[in-house]
């Protein structure tokens, strides 16, 4: 489960810089949710490779509350959140937590339930409207039909909240019907269908590039209106305030 909210006295360390680990490094405004299939359709070893992929992706993102925020959820018949979007931890600590997600190996992994959880828990309030919202649905199994009655409704609900859903089908048991339904809902909902977890590493750069391209770059930093900046012009010293409609004063 995710930690309790940070108290005002908590030291905020997640912006203490950790150098990029790779040449490609996504510095965009993005809220990214990883949903990991916890069914027995993946063996424990395959699930370890799935987690390695998530950690690999996280290494290529500029994770912080200002740039890329991440959530990590393992789903079976319910959902287990390991990292929340608002968790204020160092990127290395978040990667460590992701690598320790427990293998459930359950009979069922309900995509409907986890999309419902994403819609009503993770994106219940949109607190960063300027950021793109993307859910990476890593799926290797098929939920029973009785569980999927509201599947389309949840996908449409996510679309209304401008949440892009990118399904990644893994192996022979992934629910291709649901993947196609997700793709139909929005042009950005691009699917990746892989024959096994071994292909995750080969597709990783393409997937992370696709996600990154969907997110906006941060606007250039602006100084607050009341902040004065001393400027030296040709032959005169001026003080210009960067606020709107303010004239420079000549000293």
């Amino acid at each position: 489960p995710t930690d309790a909210p940070v108290s005002p006295t908590t030291l905020y360390v997640e912006d203490i810089s950790e150098p990029p680990l790779h040449d490609f490094y996504c510095s965009r405004l993005l809220d990214l949710v990883f949903l990991l299939d916890g069914s027995s359709r993946l063996s424990e070893a395959e699930f370890e490779v799935l987690k390695a992929f998530v950690v690999d992706m996280m290494e290529r993102l500029r994770i912080s509350q200002k740039w890329v925020r991440v959530a990590v959820v393992e789903y079976h018949d319910g959902s287990h959140a390991y990292i929340g979007l608002k968790d204020r931890k160092r990127p290395s600590e978040l990667r460590r937590i992701a690598s320790q997600v427990k293998y459930a190996g359950s009979q069922v992994a309900s995509t409907s339930e986890v999309l419902k959880y994403t819609l009503f828990q993770i994106f219940s309030k949109i607190d960063r409207p300027e950021a793109s919202r993307i859910t990476l649905l890593l799926m290797a199994s098929q939920e029973p039909q009785r569980m999927s009655r509201n599947f389309v409704r949840y996908v449409q609900g996510l679309k209304k909240k401008k949440v892009i859903v990118i399904p990644v089908g893994i192996g022979p048991h992934a629910n291709l019907k649901q993947i196609r339904l997700i793709e139909k809902q929005a042009p950005e909902n691009k699917a990746f269908v892989l024959s096994s977890v071994d292909e995750l590493e080969q597709q990783r750069d393409e997937i992370v590039s696709y996600l990154c391209d969907l997110a906006p770059e941060a606007p250039p930093p602006t100084l607050p209106p009341d902040m004065a900046q001393v400027t030296v012009g040709p032959g005169l010293l001026g003080v210009s305030t960067l606020g709107p409609k303010r004239n420079s004063m000549v000293l």
């Epitope: 070893a45 395959e46 490779v49 096994s196 071994d198």
Partner: nanobody, 116 residues
Framework: AVQLVESGGGLVQPGGSLKLSCATS????????MAWYRQASGKQRELVAT???????SYADSVKGRFTISRDNAKNTVYLQMNSLKPEDTAVYDC??????????WGQGTQVTVSS
């Protein structure tokens, strides 16, 4: 069919070390995640360590900090360096492909016995 040949097991005292090797003849090796498993007498086979094609590793809690998995793609071989061995590490150790569809038939494995 792809074959896997494990070696390097033996009898070792508690606190000792062994390095296991697992060689395969497959062209698919370099693009495949590999894993070491072990099975103690009368118990189920358990996952010990995995390594992806890119070299990212993971370990069972019981061996973290003591065992190291590695691979040499040029030699189509995966290794398991085992340090600070304990009597509870006694088992038959097997390696195999992680992905079910690629999995080779389970071989004889290599016996590791930790005893004083």
């Amino acid at each position: 069919a792809v074959q896997l040949v494990e070696s390097g097991g033996g009898l070792v005292q508690p606190g000792g070390s062994l390095k296991l090797s697992c060689a395969t003849s497959g062209s698919i090796f370099s693009s495949s995640a590999m894993a070491w498993y072990r099975q103690a007498s009368g118990k189920q086979r358990e996952l010990v360590a995995t390594i992806t094609s890119g070299g990212r590793t993971s370990y069972a809690d019981s061996v973290k900090g003591r065992f190291t998995i590695s691979r040499d793609n040029a030699k189509n071989t995966v290794y398991l360096q085992m340090n600070s061995l304990k009597p509870e590490d006694t088992a038959v150790y097997d390696c195999n492909f992680v992905v079910d569809g690629k999995r080779a038939p389970w071989g004889q494995g290599t016996q590791v016995t930790v005893s004083s």
